[in-house]
């Protein structure tokens, strides 16, 4: 069962799934000037059996100008940098090590992928939040949201994370607050 809405937004925070439940869809979006190849699937789907889950279909982008030039899936370093920060890339590798039954890992990037990934989550999915760079957690309550089914409708639980740009008097310049996410979870969707 797909979740009706996107996970809640938290000001000055991003959210990220460490692993994606079977049934999750990821749109095959291309950056400006590129489009999905004609024969390409509009989305990738997390599928699996009892022992193994993986993404069905591959996203492929081609230049809108060129007719039939399909590109390899491995991104060039320059394009990777454009898509996400280096820090985020290393954090994503952390997520790749996670192996949960019935879940897929973060799909690797494809060349000329759009800046932001659009996922369609399913009931039972958990996403984790952390304050973006330059902001700190004023309050560090449960920093996650779970898509639940109640009374036949899906809803995401409300994360109790408050991020602020105001520095606390006790904090010395250059002293950094640890980010509000368990085990330095990777970031993804920007919440504002």
């Amino acid at each position: 069962e797909l979740c009706d809405d996107d996970p809640p937004k938290i000001t000055h925070a991003t959210f990220k799934a460490v692993a994606y439940k079977e049934g999750t869809m990821l749109n095959c979006e291309c950056k400006r000037g590129f489009r999905r190849i004609k024969s390409g699937s509009p989305y990738m789907l997390c599928t699996g059996n009892s022992s193994h889950s993986s993404w069905d279909n591959q996203c492929q982008c081609t230049s809108s100008a060129a007719r039939n030039t399909t590109k390899q899936v491995t991104p060039q370093p320059e394009e990777q940098k454009e898509r996400k920060t280096t820090e985020m890339q290393s954090q994503m590798q952390l997520a790749d090590q996670v192996s949960l039954p019935g879940h897929c890992r973060e799909p690797p990037p494809w060349e000329n992928e759009a800046t932001e990934r659009i996922y369609h989550f399913v009931v039972g999915q958990t996403v984790y939040y952390q304050c973006v760079q330059g902001y700190r957690a004023l309050h560090r309550g449960p920093a996650e949201s779970v898509c639940k089914m109640t009374h036949g409708k899906t809803r995401w639980t409300q994360p109790q994370l408050i991020c602020t740009g105001e520095t606390e008097p006790s904090q010395f310049p250059g002293e950094e607050e640890p980010q509000a996410s368990p085990d330095g979870l990777p970031e993804s969707e920007t919440s504002r």
Epitope: K9, I10, H12, H139, R140, Q160, R192
Partner: antibody
Framework: QVQLVQSGAEVKKPGASLKISCKGS????????MHWVRQAPGQGLEWIGV????????IYAQKFQGRATMTVDTSTSTAYLELSSLRSEDTAVYYC????????WGQGTTVTVSS | DIQMTQSPSSLSASVGDRVTITCRAS??????LEWYQQKPGKAPKLLIY???TLAEGVPSRFSGSGSGTDFTLTISSLQPEDFATYYC?????????FGQGTKLEIK
């Protein structure tokens, strides 16, 4: 069930200080930040500030900066609001409210400032 | 600070009516908006959070919509217990501010 129970009504003289409490029960107190909101007679709602029940870190509305102090005692699951240099305009009902979306509120504490 | 402006300030309606209250933010607040109901002598009660999510235990005749700067609270069929004052509030960033309120009265 979730409950926020506030201390009783107070009558104070101008220039005095005031400390009101809000005790949370039925949930993990440190999971939710606590906000303070006030409402003058016949008026709307005014946000005073928010405190982290986890760290004690707080942010105040500019109007209350320096005059309001929010604190928490996690051992008793209680949040406190202290207001100093009281004036007649501080006459209001003071509420505590829980979490990002203010999903539960205390019953209110009526504060009267009068000479 | 972000200003929240509600309209109308007061409204007379009858049981069974469909009622709409609007709230406008002075800048884009995405969907960081709540609606509360307050009855005389009582604390406010959360009705809608994140612009459109119905709070637990709130009847389905209440609904919220909007994003950015313009938001709406709709009561599809007024019940006697719905006569109260309604407030919108943003939690986009501190300071959180409330609308001035809309008093819903019996016609």
């Amino acid at each position: 069930q979730v409950q926020l129970v506030q201390s009783g009504a107070e009558v104070k003289k101008p220039g005095a200080s005031l400390k009101i409490s809000c005790k949370g029960s039925g949930y993990t107190f440190t999971d939710y930040a606590m906000h303070w909101v006030r409402q003058a007679p016949g008026q709307g709602l005014e946000w005073i500030g928010v405190i982290s029940t986890y760290s004690g870190d707080a942010i105040y509305a500019q109007k209350f900066q320096g005059r309001a102090t929010m604190t928490v005692d996690t051992s008793t699951s209680t949040a406190y609001l202290e207001l100093s240099s009281l004036r007649s305009e501080d006459t209001a009902v003071y509420y505590c409210a829980r979490g990002v979306t203010f999903d539960y509120w205390g019953q209110g504490t009526t504060v009267t400032v009068s000479s | 600070d972000i200003q929240m402006t509600q309209s109308p300030s007061s409204l007379s309606a009858s049981v069974g009516d469909r009622v709409t209250i609007t709230c406008r933010a002075s800048q884009d607040i995405s969907n960081y908006l709540e609606w509360y109901q307050q009855k005389p002598g009582k604390a406010p009660k959360l009705l809608i959070y994140n612009a459109k999510t119905l709070a637990e235990g709130v009847p389905s005749r209440f609904s919220g919509s909007g994003s950015g700067t313009d938001f709406t609270l709709t009561i599809s069929s007024l019940q006697p217990e719905d006569f109260a004052t309604y407030y919108c509030q943003h939690h986009y960033d501190t300071p959180y501010t409330f609308g001035q309120g809309t008093k819903l009265e019996i016609k």
